[in-house]
């Protein structure tokens, strides 16, 4: 059939293929120290490594790009490691009226997949 | 803001960003031929060229990430060229009793993101 | 819901051309793929050509080749036929018609149309 | 080419059934469509994949494909459903082939 199984095991070793991992940060690396109260020191979760073939497929479309790069490497790209999910999280802003709290939806990984 | 505005003019040249492009496959190519017909060679639309900073960023994590890609790019990859979303495509298949028709709402992109 | 709207009736002299034009609403106007389908009077469905859009690429009957070009502009998602070298029997009404696009075979299972355009060729 | 074969004109008694037939070589292996014309209106998709109908057509319609012949089949024929009949599949280079149009017309 079209969807044919991702593939879930790594072959190219523990940690190098597509999956999440925590980065810190701080408000200065994204350059919102001057609206952003907290917190002073971010973790956030990052979609890492690599895409073997049929490694985590998000869907048709990423095995059919799989395929099709294993054929004509320089004109298909291999799928690469991107979030599935994400976690929403809280930051507190500065405002003009003092502070507020706001939810980013779209900040944090939750979950990676290939595409 | 935590969402700057994603550049949409690609800085690296014509052609040289995150697109849209059409790849022809034929249904071996895709490992198809025993159970999908088509007369001729398929079109598929596919995602593909560099994203070059906050070019065309999917979303807040997109662009925290190209920031962090900057100061740690042995850390965090660069964001890359990904379906935003996708087109219907209908497909013929092969089926005991003949032929019959199959929609896939994941198999061809309509527009493409960095992220 | 979708909407295909196209240009009105024409009247044209042999040897001439017209360009037809369909404007599409209420739907993602790349995702589909457009035809155009004529119809004589008194006689029936004849297909034409049609263009993909998301692919740019236009299929012509063999029919047609080389007299009929189709293009869409994905700005105004109006899609255009001119139709080249008319003669008497080109006298037909004129329709587009949208459908999924069916990988390989491209066009076909229309589901909406628009309402036709006369295009009457005479001296 | 490949070509699809229907009668001119059926007729069919108000409340019966009506078979309009499509021929055409092996036409079992197509995918056939149906399409409703009514005079001065476009044509309308009634039958597509054997027997699927789109939104608002209603269960009066079904189709059947087999051998040479694809059928068209109207239940309870109404005095609305008195039209041009069309039926439509591809050819060996995948372009659109239409069939030459049957005219019902229900009596009573």
């Known amino acids: 059939s079209a969807h044919a199984h991702p593939r879930d095991s790594c072959p190219l070793g523990p940690g190098r293929c597509c999956h999440l991992e925590t980065v810190q940060a701080t408000l200065e690396d994204l350059g919102w120290s001057d609206w952003v109260l907290s917190p002073r020191q971010l973790q956030l979760s990052m979609c890492v490594g690599e895409c073997p073939h049929l490694y985590r497929s998000a869907n048709t479309h990423a095995q059919i790009k799989a395929r099709l790069h294993g054929l004509q490497p320089d004109k298909v790209p291999a799928p690469c490691c991107v979030p599935s999910s994400y976690t929403p999280v809280v930051l507190m802003h500065r405002t003009d009226s003092g502070v507020s709290l706001q939810t980013y939806d779209d900040l944090v990984a939750r979950g990676c997949h290939c595409a | 803001s935590a969402h700057a505005h994603p550049r949409d003019s690609c800085p690296l040249g014509p052609g040289r960003c995150c697109h849209l492009e059409t790849v022809q496959a034929t249904l071996e190519d895709l490992g198809w031929s025993d159970w999908v017909l088509s007369p001729r060679q398929l079109q598929l639309s596919m995602c593909v060229g560099e994203c070059p900073h906050l070019y065309r960023s999917a979303n807040t994590h997109a662009q925290i990430k190209a920031r962090l890609h900057g100061l740690q790019p042995d850390k965090v990859p660069a964001p890359c060229c990904v379906p935003s979303s996708y087109t219907p495509v209908v497909l013929m298949h092969r089926t005991d009793s003949g032929v019959s028709l199959q929609t896939y709402d994941d198999l061809v992109a309509r527009g493409c993101h960095c992220a | 819901q979708v909407q295909l709207v196209q240009s009105g009736a024409e009247v044209k002299k042999p040897g001439s051309s017209v360009k037809v034009s369909c404007k599409a609403s209420g739907g993602t106007f790349r995702s589909y793929a457009v035809s155009w389908v004529r119809q004589a009077p008194g006689q029936g469905l004849e297909w034409m050509g049609g263009?993909?859009?998301?692919?740019?690429?236009?299929n012509y009957a063999q029919k047609f080749q080389g007299r009929v070009t189709i293009t869409a502009d994905e700005s105004t998602s109006t899609a255009y036929m001119e139709l080249s070298s008319l003669r008497s029997e080109d006298t037909a009404v004129y329709y587009c018609?949208?459908?999924?696009?069916?990988?390989?075979?491209?066009?076909?299972?229309?589901?909406?149309w628009g309402q036709g355009t006369l295009v009457t060729v005479s001296s | 080419s490949y070509e699809l074969t229907q009668p001119l004109s059926v007729s069919v008694a108000l409340g019966q059934t009506a078979r309009i037939t499509c021929s055409g070589d092996n036409i079992g292996s197509h995918i056939v469509s149906w399409y409703q014309q009514k005079p001065g209106q476009a044509p309308v998709l009634v039958i597509y994949?054997?027997?699927n109908r789109p939104s608002g057509i209603p269960e009066r319609f079904s189709g059947s494909n087999s051998g040479n012949t694809a059928t068209l089949t109207i239940s309870r024929a109404q005095a609305g459903d008195e039209a041009d009949y069309y039926c439509?599949?591809?050819?060996?280079?995948?372009?659109?082939?239409f069939g030459g149009g049957t005219k019902l017309t229900v009596l009573g």
């Open positions: 018609a949208r459908g999924p696009i069916i990988m390989g075979y491209q066009f076909g299972l229309f589901d909406h």
């Open positions: 994949d054997k027997s």
């Open positions: 263009i993909i859009p998301i692919f740019g690429t236009a």
């Open positions: 439509q599949t591809w050819d060996s280079i995948g372009s659109v082939v």
